[in-house]
Amino acid sequence: TIPPHVQKSVNNDMIVTDNNGAVKFPQLCKFCDVRFSTCDNQKSCMSNCSITSICEKPQEVCVAVWRKNDENITLETVCHDPKLPYHDFILEDAASPKCIMKEKKKPGETFFMCSCSSDECNDNIIFSEEYNTSNPDLLLVIFQ
């Protein structure tokens, strides 16, 4: 995905649908790319990203990536197509309405990633284990 404020040319009129055959509309996501963050050892954090964008492609979802190494903590917020890997990982939770962080194995750093399918859902990133698949909110498969 091309970040906001970078102009692009888009001309494609195929109809995009979700797994149930419903027409998939684009959504609103936080889109600040990589920014330094103070989010650490918290159950949840706000992105503190002031840029919201309508994803260019209807199939794209909101993504957040939290990384911590010896030097700093960063938070990345973007739109991304869940059919394509991001940072070499599949977006397995793309249908969730909430951005529930899951740890991924990356050498030399702590790496968490989440994806979600409700407007601006990557503004609030959740690390707490109390949000698991027993949470009824996560059973809502929504594409808004």
Epitope: V10, N12, P26, L28, S53, C55, D119, Q144
Partner: antibody
């Protein structure tokens, strides 16, 4: 069939208040973000406000910030717009619409007239 | 003054192709997907194009949308009398943190 039905419009004096409602049916209301859009007589469309599916995030147009409040009751499948300190320039047909990235369904609108 | 600029009027004869432009900036059209809406006289607006160029089901393929840089356009081919309406472009503005519409274009079928 998706339906959005606005109500609560009417004649109000400048400085007065009004609460608009939008009753939604035909879809899982609690799964969708919702918006209010208005249209002054003979004028173009103006976005007013947006609320996320769970009410956790809200945005307002500068022209209504601090005066209007958007809210929702997912148990009643209803969207609200509380309008305070109304001005003559708030006179318009107010539409509720589904989503924000593309307003895919619209209500028929309710007319708000602010006049003394 | 609208954030997005559209021509106030456009016209064409039946069967013709008409294009309506929508010009913005890097903070709106340049970095966000664009939608187009049709408003027939006395009715609520209807979504015509979303995500720059996608048509909702039920919208004829005579309507097409495109976007390049900070401009978008709506093309209507094989113009019909029932296409006479107001057309609005719209998108999010990342600087204003709000949705913005063009001023609207009144299409007349001669």
């Amino acid at each position: 069939e998706v339906q959005l039905l606005e109500s609560g419009g009417g004649l109000v004096q400048p400085g007065g208040s009004l609460r608009l409602s939008c009753a939604a049916s035909g879809f899982t209301f609690s799964s969708y973000s919702m918006s209010w859009v208005r249209q002054a007589p003979g004028k173009g469309l103006e976005w007013v406000s947006w609320i996320s599916y769970n009410g956790g995030s809200k945005y307002y147009a500068d022209s209504v910030k601090g005066r209007f409040t958007i809210s929702r009751d997912n148990s009643k499948n209803t969207l609200y717009l509380q309008m305070n300190s109304l001005r003559a320039e708030d006179t318009a047909v107010y539409y509720c619409a589904r989503r924000i990235a593309a307003f895919d369904y619209w209500g028929q609108g309710t007319l708000v007239t602010v006049s003394s | 003054q609208s954030v997005l600029t559209q021509p106030p009027s456009a016209s064409g004869t039946p069967g013709q192709r008409v294009t309506i432009s929508c010009t913005g900036s890097s903070s709106n059209i340049g970095s966000n997907a664009v939608s187009w809406y049709q408003q027939l006289p006395g009715t609520a607006p209807k979504l015509l194009i979303y995500a720059n160029s996608h048509r909702p089901s039920g919208v004829p393929d005579r309507f097409s949308g495109s976007k390049s840089g900070t401009s978008a356009s709506l093309a209507i081919s094989g113009l019909r009398s029932e296409d006479e309406a107001d057309y609005y472009c719209g998108t999010w503005d990342s600087s204003l943190s709000g949705y913005v519409f063009g001023g609207g274009t009144k299409l007349t079928v001669l």
